[in-house]
């Protein structure tokens, strides 16, 4: 079974990279960041 710690770790692993990719897209497309 996947531990709660591992799930939190996996979530944390991707969230800044998701924000990063979203912001790069925002700079190009000028979509609202909220």
């Amino acid at each position: 079974a996947v531990s709660e710690h591992q799930l939190l770790h996996d979530k944390g692993k991707s969230i800044q990279d998701l924000r990063r990719r979203f912001f790069l897209h925002h700079l190009i497309a000028e979509i609202h960041t909220a």
Epitope: H9, G12, K13, S14, I15, Q16, D17, R19, R20, F22, F23, L24, H25, H26, L27, I28, A29, E30, T33, A34
Partner: antibody, heavy 118, light 116 residues
Framework: QVQLVESGGGVVQPGRSLRLSCAAS????????MSWVRQAPGKGLEWVAT????????YYPDSVKGRFTISRDNSKNTLYLQMNSLRAEDTAVYYC???????????WGQGTLVTVSS | QLVLTQSPSASASLGASVKLTCTLS???????IEWYQQQPEKGPRYVMD???????STGDGIPDRFSGSSSGAERYLTISSLQSEDEADYIC?????????????FGGGTKLTVLG
């Protein structure tokens, strides 16, 4: 190929203003966010400002917020940095940089030197 | 806050390999970073972005002698078959968006000397 050429640097007295320009070529300028990054003599890099493709969104660190203004003229393929109330600590080489879909500062110019001194 | 730490200097022999380290502040250990190269008297050049899992994408014209890897809060740039033109400052950087504000910080850089 992507080319970014900065200009407008020089010697300026504290408290005065200066406007830098960055002429872009080799790509569709209006399609990308652009930034300014500076480097004080013998020091590290410092992000200064970022602007979205159409100019609707701008971002600054606290160190320059309220004094510096980034803007762009997409019809002239030119990026600007208006610097007001200049201080000695603003002395640096100023680089413009272009983003890609993958990263913030993918392409850089050769820089223009700004010296703030009385 | 978001901080990147780099050793000020490193050296390795021509043809050898070198591994440069960039360490993220502990609470930001999962972050994707970027590596830049700055040769003497030149503007910076984008080398790669490097994710927490070690995957990376390199910039235009960067030879495949440059590779990246990660372990915990550490991000590594490995240069193999060192050449004289690899002598440069290597700087890591990281960005984030917090409450609709963008923040980007650079490490202090590592000056790489290639011994001939």
């Amino acid at each position: 190929q992507v080319q970014l050429v900065e200009s407008g640097g020089g010697v300026v007295q504290p408290g005065r203003s200066l406007r830098l320009s960055c002429a872009a070529s080799g790509f569709t300028f209006s399609s990308y966010g652009m930034s300014w990054v500076r480097q004080a003599p013998g020091k590290g890099l410092e992000w200064v400002a970022t602007i979205s493709s159409g100019g609707s969104y701008t971002y600054y660190p606290d160190s320059v917020k309220g004094r510096f203004t980034i803007s762009r003229d997409n019809s002239k393929n030119t990026l600007y940095l208006q610097m007001n109330s200049l201080r000695a600590e603003d002395t640096a080489v100023y680089y413009c940089a272009r983003q890609t879909t993958m990263t913030y500062f993918a392409y850089w110019g050769q820089g223009t030197l700004v010296t703030v001194s009385s | 806050q978001l901080v990147l730490t780099q050793s000020p200097s490193a050296s390795a022999s021509l043809g050898a390999s070198v591994k440069l380290t960039c360490t993220l502040s502990s609470q930001h250990s999962t972050y994707t970073i970027e590596w830049y190269q700055q040769q003497p008297e030149k503007g910076p050049r984008y080398v790669m972005d490097l994710k927490q899992d070690g995957s990376h994408s390199t910039g235009d014209g960067i030879p495949d002698r440059f590779s990246g890897s990660s372990s915990g809060a550490e991000r590594y740039l490995t240069i193999s078959s060192l050449q004289s033109e690899d002598e440069a400052d290597y700087i890591c950087g990281v960005g984030d968006t917090i409450k609709e504000q963008f923040v980007y910080v650079f490490g202090g850089g590592t000056k790489l000397t290639v011994l001939g």
